[in-house]
Interface confidence: medium
């Protein structure tokens, strides 16, 4: 399965929307910085596109979940959030279409399950951090910047694999 060209464009637009969502400067939130331990190796270790697709799907699904909570709706601009959801939803559809076409439908390798679990744990750490920081504006800004970084890394690694095929 070949992901449509629009998937690549959607990734860039998602980053653009995340950038536009910024409300305060990260420099004013230095005391709130946190290393969430993004499992970058889980995207780099997959040697076939078939293996990256479920991991990338999990990543986007978790971003969707994170930004579609009540607390998130209160933190961000509604119009930008709606566009953000639309872009994420389209990317999830693209990835799901690939799974339906047979990519990753066969028995899931243990390595892939471990990778998906690593992504889930990463988002659990982000959710816990937000709770501990009582969903403060600085906490949300730290999370927004982190998601920009990790989403950019994961899509770049996935595109890198795609270009090698």
């Amino acid at each position: 399965c070949d992901l449509p060209q629009t998937h690549s464009l959607g990734s860039r637009r998602t980053l653009m929307l995340l950038a536009q969502m910024r409300k305060i400067s990260l420099f004013s939130c230095l005391k709130d910085r946190h290393d969430f331990g993004f499992p970058q190796e889980e995207f780099g270790n997959q040697f076939q596109k078939a293996e990256t697709i479920p991991v990338l799907h999990e990543m986007i699904q978790q971003i969707f979940n994170l930004f579609s909570t009540k607390d998130s709706s209160a933190a961000w601009d509604e119009t930008l959030l709606d566009k953000f959801y639309t872009e994420l939803y389209q990317q999830l559809n693209d990835l799901e279409a690939c799974v339906i076409q047979g990519v990753g439908v066969t028995e899931t390798p243990l390595m892939k399950e471990d990778s998906i679990l690593a992504v889930r744990k990463y988002f659990q750490r982000i959710t816990l951090y937000l709770k501990e920081k009582k969903y403060s504006p600085c906490a949300w800004e730290v999370v927004r910047a982190e998601i920009m970084r990790s989403f950019s890394l994961s899509t770049n690694l996935q595109e890198s694999l795609r270009s090698k095929e």
């Epitope: 629009t6 464009l9 860039r12 980053l15 653009m16 950038a19 770049n156 595109e159 890198s160 270009s163």
Partner: antibody, heavy 119, light 108 residues
Amino acid sequence: QVQLQQPGAELVKPGASVKLSCKASGYTFTNYWMHWVKQRPGQGLEWIGEINPSHGRTIYNENFKSKATLTVDKSSITAFMQLSSLTSEDSAVYFCARGGLGPAWFAYWGQGTLVTVSA
Amino acid sequence: QIVLTQSPAIMSASPGEKVTLTCSAGSSVDSSYLYWYQQKPGSSPKLWIYSTSNLASGVPARFSGSGSGTSYSLTISSMEAEDAASYFCHQWSSYPFTFGSGTKLEIK
């Protein structure tokens, strides 16, 4: 500051090929997609395609798929576009432009290379 | 592909006059991805307005942009000699990215 350097002109014969260059400076080359745009004399702009210098992935306008080939050389931080089987229709100015997000989208352009196809 | 039609193709305006250039899309364009570029003879295009209504760095405040769906416009509240140039609308809402045919704005 961000700069995209292109040679001023290329004179080529019909049926031949030409490889245009676009040397980048002032930013991290692999962080931004590079786009190519065609402009015929006194006419509008046509998007040819884009390449991600990080891993070489390309996306083309269907109208240029058999005409243009986009490549990059990371060591010389240069993007290239090869145009093949040239005809008079290919006589135009070709610009490279850097992609980006929001206000950075096509915010930086090369000066353009004038390609003249003539016997 | 999304065809962008600009009108008028050529227009003249006197200094101080209000000018409106239009860009009509063949199918709906997300306003976030509708841009305008200014180009002067012998030069490369310059980003002028991004995401329909945001002025690029260094663009005078007399310029403004508006629109949604299939209808967009660029307005100059008070024409000045330095505004004489060609203006192109551009969309990256969907592939292939397209540009309008341009409006050449001249000073009277």
